[in-house]
Amino acid sequence: FSGVPAMMEGSWLDVARRGKPEAQPFAHLTINAADIPSGSHKVSLSSWYHDRGWAKISNMTLSNGKLRVNQDGFYYLYANICFRHHETSGSVPADYLQLMVYVVKTSIKIPSSHNLMKGGSTKNWSGNSEFHFYSINVGGFFKLRAGEEISVQVSNPSLLDPDQDATYFGAFKVQDID
Amino acid sequence: FSGVPAMMEGSWLDVARRGKPEAQPFAHLTINAADIPSGSHKVSLSSWYHDRGWAKISNMTLSNGKLRVNQDGFYYLYANICFRHHETSGSVPADYLQLMVYVVKTSIKIPSSHNLMKGGSTKNWSGNSEFHFYSINVGGFFKLRAGEEISVQVSNPSLLDPDQDATYFGAFKVQDID
Amino acid sequence: FSGVPAMMEGSWLDVARRGKPEAQPFAHLTINAADIPSGSHKVSLSSWYHDRGWAKISNMTLSNGKLRVNQDGFYYLYANICFRHHETSGSVPADYLQLMVYVVKTSIKIPSSHNLMKGGSTKNWSGNSEFHFYSINVGGFFKLRAGEEISVQVSNPSLLDPDQDATYFGAFKVQDID
C-alpha cells in the first residue's frame, strides 16, 4: 500500500480544494469624474470605475451604476462620499445644504428601493471661507441575494469630489448564508 | 487495516490544517499620545502603539509609523481620527480649519505615495463654544502586496485627540489574491 | 479496496466539514424607535432590533441593549449613528451640541467598561435652517472573548434618527484567536 488509492485521490483533492476557499466576491468602485450629474437634487450615481486605479471587481457585476450580487451571502458594504466647493466655482446651490448619501438595494422582487444605510450632514457653506469640504462614511453588514443590486444616491451631486480616494463604494463577501 | 497509513498521515494533517485557515494578517494601531507632532500643516503620523490597550498586530510590521504588509492579499483598511480643542489650550490655529485624514500607500519599489482614502471637513472653530470636537472615519477594500506600506497623514496634528478609542487605524486581510 | 475504510470515514467528513467553515458570529442591530431615551445627557442605548428589516443576529446574543460575544475571536465592530432635528419639534437642547457616540466593551468578570471607539462632532444647530442632520460612523477590529458585551452610548439621544438605515451597530467575526 504505497500511495493513495485511486478511488480516494479525487476526494483528497476535493477536500484540499475545499480547504482553500474559492475567491469571494468583492468590489471597490470609484467615481467616474467625467460623468457626475449636475444639480442639487438627490440622484443615483450611475457611473463608477471598476478597473482603473484602486477600483476592482470580482464575482460581482457593475451595470449602470448598480453593483449586482451574483452570489448569495453576507456582505460588508461601505461607501465614502466627499463633497467640496471652492469659491472660484461660483456660489453654492443654497446657504443651507443637505449633504447626504444613501446606499440603496433594489431587486426585481421589490418595486421600490430600500435604504440600507444613510449618512450626511446639514452644512452652511455660505461663510467667509474660500474652500469647503465634507466627507461621509457609512458601512454595514447585510444579507444579499443573487440578483439584488446596490447603488448609491447622493444629494448635491455637483459638489462631489471626483478623486478616487474621495468618492467610492464597495462590498466584500464575509460568509455564506447557511 | 485499522488506522491511517503512515504515508497518508502527513497529508491528512495537511488537509485538515488547510481546512482551518492560518491566522490572517491584521493590525489595529492606536495613536501614541506622547509623540504627536505640533503645528497645523499636513504630516504623516509616525508614532503608533501596536501592543498596548486595544492595539495589536499580527503578520504585519510597524516601522516608523508605517504599517508594512508582509503577505499579499485583499485587505480592509480603516482609520478613525478625532480632532478636539478646548479654549483652555489657547486659540485654534485658524478660524477656518481643514481637518483632514489621508490613508496613504507607499512601496519600496516605487518611491511615490498614493492616497487610498481621504476624509474630513472644513470647520469654523472660532465660535462661542468652549469645546470643539470632530471625527472622521474612512474605510475601504484594497489589494496590497508584500512590501507595501500604509500610513496616515493628517492636517492640524496638534488638534488630535490622543485617546486610543479616538485616533487609530487598522487593517485585516479578507482574502488571498487568486 | 473499494471504498473508504470505516475508521477513516469520520475523519473524511471531519476534514471536509472543517473545509467548509461553520457560520461565523455576526450581528447587525437597528435602533428601536419606540424606545429611544429622551434628554440630552449621555446614555446607553438599550433597545435594538435583531430580527426585523435589516437587523439580524447569529451566534451572538442581544440582551438589554448589549451585544454579547459567545465565541472568542477577532471581530470587526461598527456603528452608524444619525442625529436630526426639525424646527417643528421645538428648539434644540442647547445652542452648542456635542453629538457623540461611544462603542463600549464590558465584561461580566470586570465590572468596569472600556471605550473601544468614539466619534462625533460639536454642532451649532441654533441657525436659520429649519432642518439639521449629522451622522457619525466608526469601525474597528477588536479581540473579543466569550462573555464580553458591546454596547453603544450616545449624547443627545432625543435627537437620534429612528430609521433602520440611520442608527445601527454591528459586528462580524473575522478570525479565531490563534
Epitope: S46, S63, Y102, T106, I108, I110, P111, S151 | - | -
Partner: antibody
C-alpha cells in the same frame, strides 16, 4: 424624448397566445425596469409583471404565473409580453411602463400608448 | 396583496372647486404611493410620486400627502382639463396594486 411605443391591436381566439411589443427610445433601455399593466374595459389597472432588461430578471403576478412571459431584446431596446391560453376575460388594453429607478421615486413613467387585445371566438 | 381602497369612486365638481381624493392602503406602505391621471382612450400619466412629490411638468394645483396607510390627492382649483379618472398606486411591494379609480366629472 423618452418614449414607449407599443405594437398594434390584436384579435385572438380563446386558447391562443398574444405577444405585445414595447419599443423604448430616448433613454438607456437597460437602466430601467419595464412593467406591464392591463386594463379591462371600464375597469381599473392590474399589474402583470416586470423585467429588468439589463439582465432578463423577471417577476410575475401570481395570478398570471405560467401564462405570462416577459422578455427583452437589448439590441432593439424592445420588451415583450406574451400571454398564453387566452380567455375572454383577457380582453383588455395592455400597457408597458418604465419604472424610474434613477431618481429614487420608482413610479411608472412614461407609459406606452396601450395595445388593445380582444379575445373572441 | 396590498389593497388600495380609493374614495369616492366618482365625484361631480365645478371649475375652480377644491377636490380631495383619498386612498387607504391595507398595510403600511411608507410613502411608496403614486397618483396617476387617465383620460378616456389614453394611458395613465404620473402626477405625484413618493406620496407628496409633484412630478416635473405637473401643475402646482395638484398636491399629495400622507404616509403609512392614508393618502390624499388634492386639486386646489379644478381646471377644465382636470376632468379625468385618478388612480393611486402602491409600490411598497409586489404585486403593484392600484386603487379602483375616482372619476371626476363636470357638475
Amino acid at each position: 424624448q423618452v418614449q414607449l411605443v407599443q405594437s398594434g391591436a390584436e384579435v385572438k381566439k380563446p386558447g391562443s397566445s398574444v405577444k405585445v411589443s414595447c419599443k423604448a427610445s430616448g433613454y438607456a433601455f437597460t437602466n430601467y425596469y419595464i412593467e406591464w399593466v392591463r386594463q379591462a374595459p371600464g375597469q381599473g389597472l392590474e399589474w402583470m409583471g416586470v423585467i429588468n432588461p439589463g439582465w432578463g430578471d423577471t417577476n410575475y403576478n401570481e395570478k398570471f404565473k405560467g401564462r405570462v412571459t416577459i422578455t427583452a431584446d437589448k439590441s432593439t431596446s424592445t420588451a415583450y409580453m406574451e400571454l398564453s391560453s387566452l380567455r375572454s376575460e383577457d380582453t383588455a388594453v395592455y400597457y408597458c411602463a418604465r419604472r424610474d429607478t434613477a431618481h429614487g421615486y420608482y413610479a411608472l413613467d412614461p407609459w406606452g400608448q396601450g395595445t388593445t387585445v380582444t379575445v373572441s371566438s | 396583496d396590498i389593497q388600495m381602497t380609493q374614495s369616492p369612486s366618482s365625484l361631480s365638481a365645478s371649475v375652480g372647486d377644491r377636490v380631495t381624493i383619498t386612498c387607504k392602503a391595507s398595510q403600511n406602505v411608507g410613502t411608496n404611493v403614486a397618483w396617476y391621471q387617465q383620460k378616456p382612450g389614453k394611458a395613465p400619466k404620473l402626477l405625484i410620486y413618493s406620496a407628496s412629490y409633484r412630478y416635473s411638468g405637473v401643475p402646482s394645483r395638484f398636491s399629495g400627502s400622507g404616509s403609512g396607510t392614508d393618502f390624499t390627492l388634492t386639486i386646489s382649483s379644478l381646471q377644465p382639463e382636470d376632468f379625468a379618472t385618478y388612480y393611486c398606486q402602491q409600490y411598497w411591494d409586489y404585486p403593484l396594486t392600484f386603487g379602483g379609480g375616482t372619476k371626476v366629472e363636470i357638475k
